[in-house]
Each structure stands twice: as structure tokens, then as C-alpha cells.
Amino acid sequence: MDSFNYTTPDYGHYDDKDTLDLNTPVDKTSNTLRVPDILALVIFAVVFLVGVLGNALVVWVTAFEAKRTINAIWFLNLAVADFLSCLALPILFTSIVQHHHWPFGGAACSILPSLILLNMYASILLLATISADRFLLVFKPIWCQNFRGAGLAWIACAVAWGLALLLTIPSFLYRVVREEYFPPKVLCGVDYSHDKRRERAVAIVRLVLGFLWPLLTLTICYTFILLRTWSRRATRSTKTLKVVVAVVASFFIFWLPYQVTGIMMSFLEPSSPTFLLLKKLDSLCVSFAYINCCINPIIYVVAGQGFQGRLRKSLPSLLRNVLTEESVVRESKSFTRSTVDTMAQKTQAV
């Protein structure tokens, strides 16, 4: 082979604000976080603090009641789903602080960001189960008296969790770490390797099963429940219904941006300006969805204060009052301290 000095003319001026440029040294890259990322970090911090403490408290309160109170079983499972998701937040927080660098490895990349989707599916399936329960209490009170028990409630929860895990698998499988050449950075994200159809399919399934179908069915469900409740002019407390409606509403509100951006990105080219804009908002949308993981304990406390007039009781007893209300006089053949209604009123209980 010929041996000669290979030289190339040096560069003139470059006005390219680039991180990988022909004349940009390695250490000359930007260290400022984008505004959406800063907002996401603030939300993550708040959600983590409120979510871990709030859901831990809900778990503690409802765990003791779950053997005999069906409402406690529902709220316990919701709290566990939220608590689990909150555990991933310190890692997600750290990654955003490091400009989305992911030093935690491939396994963590597959598992931790998938927890919020597991939470989404678990939450909506549990909310659907709770809503079905509320519906049956209103429209099939005799059936509820005979068959509505803790055992059946736990089976329903187990089915919800199983389905949630199944629905999370696609997102889990397509999550990969991508190592960028310059600046040296490892990114954790989804990779459908060219297959836009598969990416769209996953996004559509997520939108339909995790948002649109539940939104439609739960809206119909609560319309019927509320109509029946108002027509009967129920005199007993409707606090569980109010709490459940608030939880359901918050679910859809906080998941909306994530779902909208997700479906849009699946139909856009990765190099298109709209895609790149939405990608910048991704962390913010995820953090907004994460508010679901801390909002329930807040709803319970607000509801408790509303029902109590003002916060006279300790937080655990206030939560216990909201979360373990009996919907049918004899649940699991036992009375609880919150059962004060007469048999005549019980059929109107929602």
C-alpha cells in the first residue's frame, strides 16, 4: 500500500449550533436543561414525596380492613399500583438531571419506565372493576347481598393485575438502551427497528384499551349510577361514589397528554419537526401521567375533610373513614365501625 501524508484543508467558520460538529471539541456541549424537563423534575419530586408517603399510608390503613371490607380491597390495590410506580421515580429523576443519560443498564431500562404503563393498565382495570362493583350495588343489590364477598374481590383484582402485566409486555419488550457516540451518552427508549406499523399498533392498543374504551364504558356506567342515585334521592352517604368518580376523572385528565403525544409520535417520522417537538415534551407528559400515582391519597384526604366538615380526626382515621365505608350492611358476614345505615337505606347505597 502507498504511504503518504493525507491532509485536508482546515475548516472555515461554522455557525452550526451542533453538539457533534467538525470543529466542536468534546467538552463544549450545553449543560442547561430544557424548560419541559425542569417542570418534569419538579412534578417527579412532588409526586415521589406525596405518592410514597400517601400511598404507604393508604396501604397501611386499608391492609387491616381488606379482610372484611371490599372497598378497602379496591383502594388497597390502587395504592399498591401507585406505590410501585413511585419507586421508579428517583431513577427517572436522575436520568433527566443527566440530560436523559441512562447509566442503569438494559434490565432497568426495560422494567422501570414500564412501571408507569403497568400502573396505567392496573389502575384502569381496577377502576373498571370498582365501577362494575358500584354498578352492581345500585342495580343488583340482592345479588350483591348473596355473592359480593372479599374472595371474589381479590379474584377480580388478581385478574386485573394479570391483564395489566400482559398489556405492559409489548412496551417492556421494545425498550432498549441506545448508546450515542458523541457526546458519550446512553439513552433508554423504545426501538421498533423500522417497523412503524408495529409501533402504531402498540400506540393504538394503548390508546384504545388504556384510555378510549375505559372512558366510554365508565362514562356510561357512572351516568347510569348517578341517574339512579338522583332518581332515588339516596339519603345515605355517597362518599365512596364521589371518591371513585374523582379518581376515575383524574385518571383520564392526567393520562390525556401522554396518550395524545404517544399516538401522534407513532404516526410521525422521527426526523419531522413535530415529532422532535413532541419528543421534547415526552418527559413532561410522563411526569403529568405520574400525578395519578399521588393524586388518590389527596382525593381521599380532601373527601375526608369534606365529609368531616374540617380535619378534626387524625389522618389514618380520616382515611379509614373514606376508604373502608361499607356499601352493603353485611360484607363478609361482619359489621365494621363505619356501618351505621339501616337495612332500608342499604339498597340505595353507592
Epitope: L20, D21, L22, T24, E180, F182, P184
Partner: antibody, heavy 116, light 112 residues
């Protein structure tokens, strides 16, 4: 003017090691990666890895992790690549190039021939 | 690893013809900085590769304007508007978005 001057051709026996050099001039040595690329006869280019002189960090292509060792001598602005346990498949031209971006500046290449 | 698929492997042309080389990557080359690090090199016999186009469409200094690059995401093209004798050689596409940096198999531009 950016220049990368590589050491001359090497004829080695299977199982031996070889160390080639790449003398850099014309820019701040510690500001950019030094990347190494392999080209077997009549074949495409394969990226071996880079060495970042500023912090001593190296990144290897998984394929070459146990084959190549990258080092630098900052005082002489020279990069080195040592190839271990050579086999006939290691016979190729090895280029050094300035990295941290598209490979705009290349050395002339070092031909390594592995022969019994 | 990102696989770079170049077509055609051989491109016979006459001087003055237009030439087009395609390069497809196995995954998106959009970097987190929003840039796409897809480059084109020309290697003549017995020489080192030389940079022609960087970041999809930017001509390197000294490269004639008959060379142009285009594309986005995973599909890229190098065009030579009027082939000259000095353009003959092997053209490689390469990505430096992800580790490891990878190259296409090469397209040999030769006279008919």
C-alpha cells in the same frame, strides 16, 4: 493544518502482538477523540473504537474489545493501538482518524500482514 | 449494532451521467441533539477514505457542488449530478449517531 501520520507496515506471526502509532498535529490533541478503523483487503470499514485523550476514556466496538488496546501519549500528541493474539483475519489496513464527529481527517493507514 | 445497507454495490456510469447511491439504516439515526449523523466518504484505490458529505446534506470543504446528500430518519441518498473521472472509487455511507460507528458495504462507482 490537521495531520495524522501513522507508523509503517508490519509483518507479524500468528499469536504475536503489534503496536502501531498515530502522530497528530494541527489541532488541540485533547479536544477530540482519536478513532481507529479497520479495513480488510477489498472490504468495508469497521470501527474499532476511540480514545479520548482529555480524560483517558476509551470506548470499544464489542467485536474488538479483547483484540485491541488504545492508548495515547499526550506529551508527544501520539495515539497508539496494540493488537493482541493476531490471527490471519487481523491482516488489514488500520486507520486512525480524528473523531467526535464525522471522520474528516484520516491517517494514511498502517498495513498489518499476519503470516506464518 | 446499526446495520447500514447500501445499494447498489456496483454502479457503472458514463462520464457526465447522474449517479445516485442509496443507504438505509436498521434504526433511526436521529440523535438526541435532533441532528442526524449520516456521512458519506469516497475512497480511491490505495488512499484513505475522504469525507464528502456530513450530517446528511452538508458538503465538506473543498467538495464540489455536484455532490449532494439528502434523506431523513433511516433512508438516505448521495447524488452526483455529473460524474467526472476523479469521482470514480468506492463510496461508503456511515453513521456516527450510535456506538458502534458503522459503515455501509460500499458502492463502487466505475465506468461502463
Amino acid at each position: 493544518q490537521v495531520q495524522l501520520q501513522q507508523s509503517g507496515p508490519e509483518l507479524v506471526k500468528p499469536g504475536d502482538s503489534v503496536k502501531m502509532s498515530c502522530k497528530v498535529s494541527g489541532y488541540t490533541f485533547t479536544d477530540y477523540y482519536i478513532d481507529w478503523v479497520k479495513q480488510s483487503h477489498g472490504k468495508s470499514l469497521e470501527w474499532i473504537g476511540y480514545f479520548y485523550p482529555n480524560n483517558g476514556g476509551a470506548k470499544y466496538n464489542q467485536k474488538f474489545k479483547s483484540k485491541a488496546a488504545l492508548t495515547v501519549d499526550k506529551s508527544s500528541t501520539t495515539a497508539y493501538m496494540e493488537l493482541h493474539s493476531l490471527t490471519f483475519e487481523d491482516s488489514a489496513v488500520y486507520y486512525c482518524t480524528r473523531g467526535s464527529g464525522p471522520f474528516a481527517y484520516w491517517g494514511q493507514g498502517t498495513l498489518v500482514t499476519v503470516s506464518a | 449494532d446499526v446495520v447500514m445497507t447500501q445499494t447498489p454495490l456496483s454502479l457503472p456510469v458514463s462520464l457526465g451521467d447522474q449517479a445516485s447511491i442509496s443507504c438505509r439504516s436498521s434504526q433511526s439515526l436521529v440523535h438526541s441533539s435532533e441532528n442526524t449523523y449520516l456521512h458519506w466518504y469516497l475512497q480511491k484505490p490505495g488512499q484513505s477514505p475522504k469525507l464528502l458529505i456530513y450530517k446528511v446534506s452538508n458538503r465538506f470543504s473543498g467538495v464540489p457542488d455536484r455532490f449532494s446528500g439528502s434523506g431523513s430518519g433511516t433512508d438516505f441518498t448521495l447524488k452526483i449530478s455529473r460524474v467526472e473521472a476523479e469521482d470514480l472509487g468506492v463510496y461508503f455511507c456511515s453513521q456516527s449517531t450510535l456506538v458502534p460507528v458503522t459503515f455501509g458495504a460500499g458502492t463502487k462507482l466505475e465506468l461502463k
